[in-house]
């Protein structure tokens, strides 16, 4: 079976040129058109361009001035260069084959490679990804919350972009694994007490504990699952007020 694999840098600086390569295995690269398609996190797909194994190309007019594609039949590879990068070029980049010259449907795709255009090095804390940065940034607040039993407490989680209702909340007690409390922003996981509730959609979400019990003192994490890779907030520790 034909397989495609993208390779290239995960992090590129603004104004630089992105270079990606797609390696085709399980079949010959010859006599097919090959394409690049990209998908900003949580968004739709955008066709970048196509190349035939003879080297002839067609590009999306909106990107034409910045795109160059090439093919190396001896290595069964084709490549994309995208110049003058900006943050708007942050996306998952897919290479794909299409079935015949005219029809343009893509029968085989690579798994995609995430390209982040940023002048920084990416976050290393919480649910961040350490070197390349995940595309969706999550800000959880407060990081520490002091409360007494019986209190009502609220924890906030804010996204850098719209994630619809694809948000979950977890509770983690010291020395234990996290446990799922809420999914789909407001749906209570089976067995979770009704004093826990979640609300919000889009970019702003809230976890509320209506009457704090002694067993609720723990660290709480939000998690988005709208875009790949799934990421977590940095956590909110709910501690006993002395």
């Amino acid at each position: 079976q034909v397989q495609l694999q993208e390779s290239g840098p995960g992090l590129v600086k603004p104004s630089e040129t992105l270079s990606l390569t797609c390696t085709v295995s399980g079949g010959s690269i010859s006599n097919y058109y090959w394409s690049w398609i990209r998908q900003p996190a949580g968004k739709g797909l955008e066709w970048i361009g196509r190349i035939y194994t003879s080297g002839s190309t067609n590009y999306n007019p909106s990107l034409k001035s910045r795109v160059t594609m090439s093919v190396d039949t001896s290595k069964n590879q084709f490549s994309l260069k995208l110049s003058s990068l900006t943050a708007a070029d942050t996306a998952i980049y897919y290479c794909a084959r299409y079935y015949d010259i005219l029809t343009g449907f893509f029968d085989y795709w690579g798994q995609g490679t995430l390209v982040t255009v940023s002048s920084g090095g990416g976050g290393s804390g919480g649910g961040g990804s350490g070197g390349g940065g995940s595309v969706i940034w999550m800000t959880q607040s407060p990081s520490l919350l002091s409360a007494s039993t019986g209190d009502s407490v609220t924890i906030s989680c804010r996204m850098s972009q719209d994630i619809s209702s694809y948000l979950a909340w977890y509770q983690q007690k010291p020395g234990k694994a996290p446990e799922l409390l809420i999914y789909a922003a407001s749906s209570l996981q089976s067995g979770v007490p009704s004093r826990f509730s979640g609300s919000g959609s889009g970019t702003d979400f809230t976890l509320t504990i209506s009457s704090l019990q002694s067993e609720d003192f723990a660290t709480y994490y939000c998690q988005q699952y709208d875009s790949f890779p799934p990421t977590f907030g940095q956590g909110t520790k709910v501690e006993f007020k002395r």
Partner: antibody, heavy 119, light 112 residues
Framework: QVTLKESGPGILKPSQTLSLTCSFS??????????VGWIRQPSGKGLEWLAH???????HYHPSLKSQLTISKDTSRNQVFLKITSVDTTDTATYYC???????????WGPGTTLTVSS | DVMMTQTPLSLPVSLGDQASISCRSS???????????LHWYLQKPGQSPKLLIY???NRFSGVPDRFSGSGSGTDFTLKISRVEAEDLGVYFC?????????FGGGTKLEIK
Amino acid sequence: QVTLKESGPGILKPSQTLSLTCSFSGFSLNTFGMGVGWIRQPSGKGLEWLAHIWWDDDKHYHPSLKSQLTISKDTSRNQVFLKITSVDTTDTATYYCVRRYRYDVFDYWGPGTTLTVSS
Amino acid sequence: DVMMTQTPLSLPVSLGDQASISCRSSQSLVHSNGNTYLHWYLQKPGQSPKLLIYKVSNRFSGVPDRFSGSGSGTDFTLKISRVEAEDLGVYFCSQSTHGPWTFGGGTKLEIK
């Protein structure tokens, strides 16, 4: 009852390869939509998703760690495996095995296995 | 560019239900050769899209027969006769009649 349990070496030297095993019960990785993966948590820090394998053998990796990670499964033995090559001290963490199903959230977690990377 | 408009954005269904997704193009997708190059893809979370239907109504190899495509000109529909858990994800329509090839914004099929 769904349970997951991680096992690993506990301690490794820098540059070695980490091999983790997740043994689970109460569900099958043959079920449509079912997945098992790995999340890690350095001591006192936040959570980071690493990799996932689905019922149809599709595999997904954290983009920034993709070159170091390999996930695989033995469906008949109800086990999932993770390999991380060339570990260093920053890989010191508790590693959790997690189930993902239906709502694409991590609905069940193992107790975790601790890895220390030290020379 | 040909604009592709998909409705609804989100489609909550129960397993076993029928689901219907609409795709409308800003101009006719009938090619001068008589063919209509409208295709459907399914993208599961964290995966690349997979081809389901090509040229309006042709199921790609391995695609279950509960998936069917129909339509002509500018109005197209994807139907799933009995939704299964493996069908959850984002569905995209795509046209390759007119350059540049364009995609719809996606419809998220999710459990009610």
